[in-house]
Interface confidence: low
């Protein structure tokens, strides 16, 4: 089964005359009749054994014929056949003039024929068009033709039936010769057998569709090559289905008993050492300064009140430190200070006794400083100017000459970064090479000192006798700096009346 297709392309009848030589009035309104028949050595009249077809009026005198296959199938002309194509044919094409609208043969005058051509030959099935041109004395016809198979017919003679399908009975398309070509993922004579996912385990997996890998009971994974462990197996694996071989550190039938609590839960805090001591049992060995089951509690060495004579205790990483009140010194503020009799003032400093000789003060000459006038005032020795600033001594004071781009008393501010005062709550802004840094006042933290971090222990004014109060941020406690004449952790005792401590 197939179709002989004839594509009319151009008809030339410049003088607009009939085959008899008589002119058409007003012009030759031309249509065509086509007859397809079996091969004849000399094409003669008789039945059109392979089929016949007529066109409507396609033009007047000379015209090109539009390809109209999309608009109803008029050109190319279709001559279907439902037998094996023999490979040879005869073709007769007649051009007729239609004086009126009735194109039936009996309705036309016998001399309405414009031209008639007849060809014969061999023609193989194929997609390529054969182009031909036939010329008579007065007319010329250009056309092309071919034979193609109908849907589902294949082979050299359109005799092989093959219908593509994609269902339970097969998954294939048809090759040009009519043989089956399996769709991707299918195999077998009729392409009914799915090709499983590449690598799907032969014994443990199977498939009902291509690229699928369905697992048999006891197996899992994309390729069904992983066994399923025993139901309830928590921390274990298997090499065959339903096993439960415990991972390191786990035990029990379902591998749910924790034999390595230290590794799995890291319960010990603050750098303590963890030791497993049985199922879900462990012991923490604390670093100095920590206590508790998990070493979660910080020991405070100030708890034993080691500072004497009203000294204030401050916890430090490596122990503690006593802040002694005026008149006392030593690790625990256990020593009283020198008196003027000891000539403590250097560099010509004058000694003045205080509090009935209990302590003293040095009045230093110009250019010397320190509690004993032991330091020369060279305000530039400590390189106070940041960011390459130049330090200049100006008598009793100093000044910093800053490099371009920096400002502030110590050239510590980068003009561009710190100019917009980014540090909150009175934080000090420092310019760095790639940004800025805020040094926050007590009680605040964060990149811009925006986070309030502690309670101000000095807020309740705990120091007496006009002492200066300082907040110790590490412990949220306060330290009182006593004026002359007062001692005690709150400067509450006059020097003349020392407190009675129980030691």
């Amino acid at each position: 089964s197939g179709v002989f297709q004839l594509q009319l392309q151009e008809f030339i009848n410049e003088r607009g005359v009939l085959a008899s030589g008589r002119p058409c009035e007003p012009g030759c309104r031309t249509f065509f009749r086509v007859c397809l028949k079996h091969f004849q050595a000399v094409v003669s009249p008789g039945p059109c054994t392979f089929g016949t077809v007529s066109t409507p009026v396609l033009g007047t005198n000379s015209f090109a014929v539009r390809d109209d296959s999309s608009g109803g199938g008029r050109n190319p002309l279709q001559l279907p056949f439902n037998f094996t194509w023999p490979g040879t044919f005869s073709l007769i094409i007649e051009a007729w003039h239609a004086p009126g609208d009735d194109l039936r043969p009996e309705a036309l005058p016998p001399d309405a024929l414009i031209s008639k051509i007849a060809i014969q030959g061999s023609l193989a099935v194929g997609q390529n068009w054969l182009l031909d041109e036939q010329t008579s004395t007065l007319t010329r016809l250009r056309y092309s033709y071919r034979v193609i198979c109908s849907d589902n017919y294949y082979g050299d003679n359109c005799s092989r039936l093959c219908k593509k399908r994609n269902d339970h009975f097969g998954h294939y398309v048809c090759q040009p010769d009519g043989n089956l070509s399996c769709l991707p993922g299918w195999t077998g004579e009729y392409c009914q057998q799915p090709i499983c996912l590449s690598g799907c385990h032969e014994q443990n997996g199977y498939c009902s569709k291509p690229a699928e890998c369905l697992c048999r009971p006891g197996w899992q994974g994309r390729l069904c090559n992983e066994c399923i462990p025993h139901n309830g197996c928590r921390h274990g694996t298997c090499s065959t289905p339903w096993q439960c071989t415990c991972d390191e550190g786990w035990g029990g039938l379902f591998c749910d008993q924790d034999l390595n609590y230290c590794t799995h839960h890291s319960p010990c805090k603050n750098g303590a050492t963890c030791s497993n001591s049985g199922q879900r049992s462990y012991t923490c060995t604390c670093r100095p300064g920590y206590t508790g089951v998990d070493c979660e509690l910080e020991l405070s060495e100030c708890d034993s009140n080691p500072c004497r004579n009203g000294g204030s205790c401050k916890d430090q990483e490596d122990g503690y430190h006593c802040l002694c009140p005026p008149g006392y010194y030593g690790l625990h503020c256990e020593h009283s200070t020198l008196s003027c009799a000891d000539s403590p003032c250097f560099n010509g400093g004058s000694c003045r006794e205080r509090n009935q000789g209990a302590n003293y003060a040095c009045e230093c000459p110009p250019n010397f400083t320190g509690s004993n006038c032991e330091k020369k005032v060279d305000r530039c020795t400590s390189n106070p100017c940041a960011n390459g600033g130049q330090c200049l001594n100006r008598g009793p004071s100093r000044m910093c000459r800053c490099r371009p781009g920096f400002t502030g008393t110590y050239c510590e501010l980068h003009v561009s970064d710190c100019a917009r005062n980014p540090c909150a709550h009175g934080g000090t802004c420092h310019d760095l090479e790639n940004g800025l840094m805020c040094t926050c006042p007590a009680g605040f933290s964060g990149r811009r000192c925006e986070v309030r971090t502690s309670i101000d222990a000095c807020a309740s004014s705990p120091c007496f006798n006009r002492a200066t109060c300082y907040t110790d941020l590490s412990t949220d406690t306060f330290v009182c700096n006593c004026p002359y004449g007062f001692v005690g952790s709150r400067c509450e005792f006059p020097v003349g009346l020392p407190p009675s401590f129980p030691w």
Epitope: C213, C224, I228
Partner: antibody
Framework: QVQLVQSGAEVKKPGASVKVSCKAS??????????ITWVRQAPGQGPEWMGW????????NYAQKLQDRVTVTTDTSTSTAYMELRSLRSDDTAVYYC?????????????????WGQGTMVTVSS | QSVLTQPPSASGTPGQRVTISCYSS??????????VYWYQQLPGTAPKLLIY???QRPSGVPDRFSGSESGTSASLAISGLRSEDEADYYC????????????FGGGTKLTVL
């Protein structure tokens, strides 16, 4: 019982992108045994399949009409799947669901979309 | 590509038996080539798997729900209809054309009168 919990509702402007998450409760081993499919449902419409990912090996498959705009991924360490849709249009307004898929199947008792997330409403409006 | 067509609505009275059909058309029009899945969606909730592989019921789904297929159509039957069965029902199937994708039917709104 495994549950799928999705991220909250989103309101986006046309041309923007949205990323919806879908977290599976249960163990890592459970999560990687399955695929996650994403389905959306416009108001008053039926469900539309968007795409699928295997949590086992990361293989993906997308609906042809969305494949230039959608990406699905998984993070097996958190048992979470993600769906990102780019170049949003007003007709992308829908409830987006994740569902557990049968691929790879272990064993053959589990089936397509047997567990669904609660859905995430995505509204695209200028 | 395949298209799954469902009737937009169906109805029945309590105790009655109701059937919802799902027709396949397109490049893979023989629905028998693929497994059909049915989902129930109650208002404001996610769909719920009702039937898988044409006629299999997940645990927890009452045996009042059953599925079948023949040729180009599949059916969901609900016997002993109850008021709580009022919902949208969707069929779905995996279509192997192109690179493979899931196709959902347009849904059937079941009303219990």
């Amino acid at each position: 019982q495994v549950q799928l919990v999705q991220s909250g509702a989103e309101v986006k402007k046309p041309g923007a992108s949205v990323k919806v998450s879908c977290k599976a409760s249960g163990t890592y081993r459970t999560f990687t045994n399955y695929g996650i499919t994403w389905v959306r449902q416009a108001p008053g419409q039926g469900p539309e399949w968007m795409g699928w990912i295997s949590a086992y090996n990361g293989n993906t498959n997308y609906a042809q009409k969305l494949q230039d705009r959608v990406t699905v991924t998984t993070d097996t360490s958190t048992s979470t799947a993600y769906m990102e849709l780019r170049s949003l249009r007003s007709d992308d307004t829908a409830v987006y669901y994740c569902a557990r898929d049968r691929v790879p199947r272990i064993p053959v008792t589990t089936e397509a979309f047997d567990i669904w997330g609660q859905g995430t409403m995505v509204t695209v409006s200028s | 590509q395949s298209v799954l067509t469902q009737p937009p609505s169906a109805s029945g009275t309590p105790g009655q038996r109701v059937t919802i059909s799902c027709y396949s058309s397109g490049s893979s029009s023989n629905i028998g080539s693929y497994f059909v899945y049915w989902y129930q969606q109650l208002p404001g909730t996610a769909p719920k798997l009702l039937i898988y592989r044409n006629n299999q019921r997940p645990s927890g789904v009452p045996d009042r729900f059953s599925g079948s297929e023949s040729g180009t159509s599949a059916s969901l039957a609900i016997s002993g209809l109850r008021s709580e069965d009022e919902a949208d029902y969707y069929c779905a199937a995996w279509d192997d054309s192109l690179s493979g994708h899931w196709v959902f039917g347009g849904g059937t709104k079941l009303t219990v009168l």
